[in-house]
Amino acid sequence: IWELKKDVYVVELDWYPDAPGEMVVLTCDTPEEDGITWTLDQSSEVLGSGKTLTIQVKEFGDAGQYTCHKGGEVLSHSLLLLHKKEDGIWSTDILKDQKEPKNKTFLRCEAKNYSGRFTCWWLTTISTDLTFSVKSSRGSSDPQGVTCGAATLSAERVRGDNKEYEYSVECQEDSACPAAEESLPIEVMVDAVHKLKYENYTSSFFIRDIIKPDPPKNLQLKPLKNSRQVEVSWEYPDTWSTPHSYFSLTFCVQVQGKSKREKKDRVFTDKTSATVICRKNASISVRAQDRYYSSSWSEWASVPCS
Amino acid sequence: RNLPVATPDPGMFPCLHHSQNLLRAVSNMLQKARQTLEFYPCTSEEIDHEDITKDKTSTVEACLPLELTKNESCLNSRETSFITNGSCLASRKTSFMMALCLSSIYEDLKMYQVEFKTMNAKLLMDPKRQIFLDQNMLAVIDELMQALNFNSETVPQKSSLEEPDFYKTKIKLCILLHAFRIRAVTIDRVMSYLNAS
């Protein structure tokens, strides 16, 4: 058993049929010695008396808010949560496996630039009685500071018969140099509590590996005289690291119709303009990627050919 | 400790081309190592990230773009003195700081070159003959060093009398290649910045 926060405790249980469970001793936070009784949750049934209560925690029915009283007055609470371990593996029931970029990916993180600011998000099908708390650091043995905000519900989607909820959090490394060469990864730890179930999820990464620039901005077309070609130009996104001559991007320019199956024109360039063939009912799209370290491409920025 | 804006004219910077070749060569070599050594811990997640130039050179700090010198997190107090002549400095306006930056890059290359050559000698003794360093990568390191053209004491190639542990050597190769790729990215960024200034 360990303390998650004040008056909240996590009991780690090997989860299998007829498991013996864990013996837990609760102590009432009071100077009083006599006349103390214990109850669980909203029940008025007295579970025991005395300053300590010993319980055998085997299942979720044994978890919950234990309260010690004296003469009708509440003295203190202890909330017990369960963390299940099945076949030596901690449960991952609360969050959905996003399977990208690999199986068992529960947390996904992205950074728009090298400033040390990043966003992580996760998915769940649970809508109520759910809380998250996020901590982060650079390295684990001698951790350096990363400050994370509160996790918030950022999107809701319908997937078949289920509703899916996306939560996200923004974090900022306390003293980040955009030009630094990372040797210690960022560690992100998410505590998830659903009703009386506790789970924790972690992710470890270098900022350079989670870079995904914003799409290029200000796309403009200029038709070329006596030709089917158009010159398309754009600018670096505002959120990208500066100076741009140091933090350079490379671009992919594509002309395609509404359907992915349609024919296309595609060209890669390090410049902020390119010449392509425009077709009726097609769109010109441009996306960006770090020129020197190939992490993710940005989303497409698009303009219609016409 | 930063790069001034007054630097060589665009197109007068022979190191840019060599640095692009360097990044390409080390990226290819790392990809080859990951594929060939698929049963060894050779991915970014599996290896320890070591920097053989730590406390010996200060490339990131010495080559910091002017715009980042306002960022206190970028200004470490490491100081290293270097020799200051070089053929990539194709302008009289070149400052002492730029010379310091380029000589720091030169020292990085020299250290990695020695490590890679020592390692290759060991890998050539491996009866499995599983992996060797790409001669193209070694040649590209050499070309960039020549373009930088700094006079520097030659570092003797390390020789080891004991029987090499090939498993450890291959893991060390992965560690070195990962670190060198990150440094090659920095070098490419620096050259691009200098070329544009």
Epitope: Q229, R261, E262, K263, D265, V267, F268, R279 | -
Partner: antibody, heavy 118, light 107 residues
Framework: EVQLVQSGAEVKKPGATVKISCKAS????????LHWVRQAPGKGLEWMGW????????EYAPKFQGKVTITADTSTDTGYLELSSLRSEDTAVYYC???????????WGQGTLVTVSS | DIQMTQSPSSVSASVGDRVTITCRAS??????LHWYQQKPGKAPKLLIK???QSISGVPSRFSGSGSGTDFSLTINSLQPEDFATYYC?????????FGGGTKVEIK
Amino acid sequence: EVQLVQSGAEVKKPGATVKISCKASGYTFSDYYLHWVRQAPGKGLEWMGWIDPENGDTEYAPKFQGKVTITADTSTDTGYLELSSLRSEDTAVYYCAANKELRYFDVWGQGTLVTVSS
Amino acid sequence: DIQMTQSPSSVSASVGDRVTITCRASQSISINLHWYQQKPGKAPKLLIKFASQSISGVPSRFSGSGSGTDFSLTINSLQPEDFATYYCQQSNSFPLTFGGGTKVEIK
């Protein structure tokens, strides 16, 4: 299977015109760009131009502007290359090539040898 | 027009050898470079697109690299069926242009 089948070899006199064909099968003809590339005996490859069969748009290499005409007939899924004012230097194997992407060549015809000789 | 220069123009090699062919563009073409293989009397066949992207059905011993002006095609362990002429082609701008070709011959 995506396939391009070209018409047979041609022998022409200098100054004449030749029209060679390229029949597409295994895909929707208008879904791919169609290019023509030539190769003189013992020489390298030379791109001549492309057509978008969907709308008849064409683009030619400057060297072949006015010399060649590329057309397409969607009713028969066939592309054509017409070469006019033939000279001995036009002796070559002419290939049609197609792709959903405009700028490189995924599928090739078997080639048509055009010989210009007096 | 963008000129593409291939080197060497021919190379003699044995089965099992590693062969590298280079292609240089007269100006920067990013990764807009494709490689083809042509056997005598046959049409060319696409091997690599956009400098390093593999083509399904092409053996993994063929790999490409490069960007900007310098590119290379590597055949890792030469097989008897690989003796052919190889061409690079730029798609950065029209007109599309090819390199002069590199003939890989049996030593």
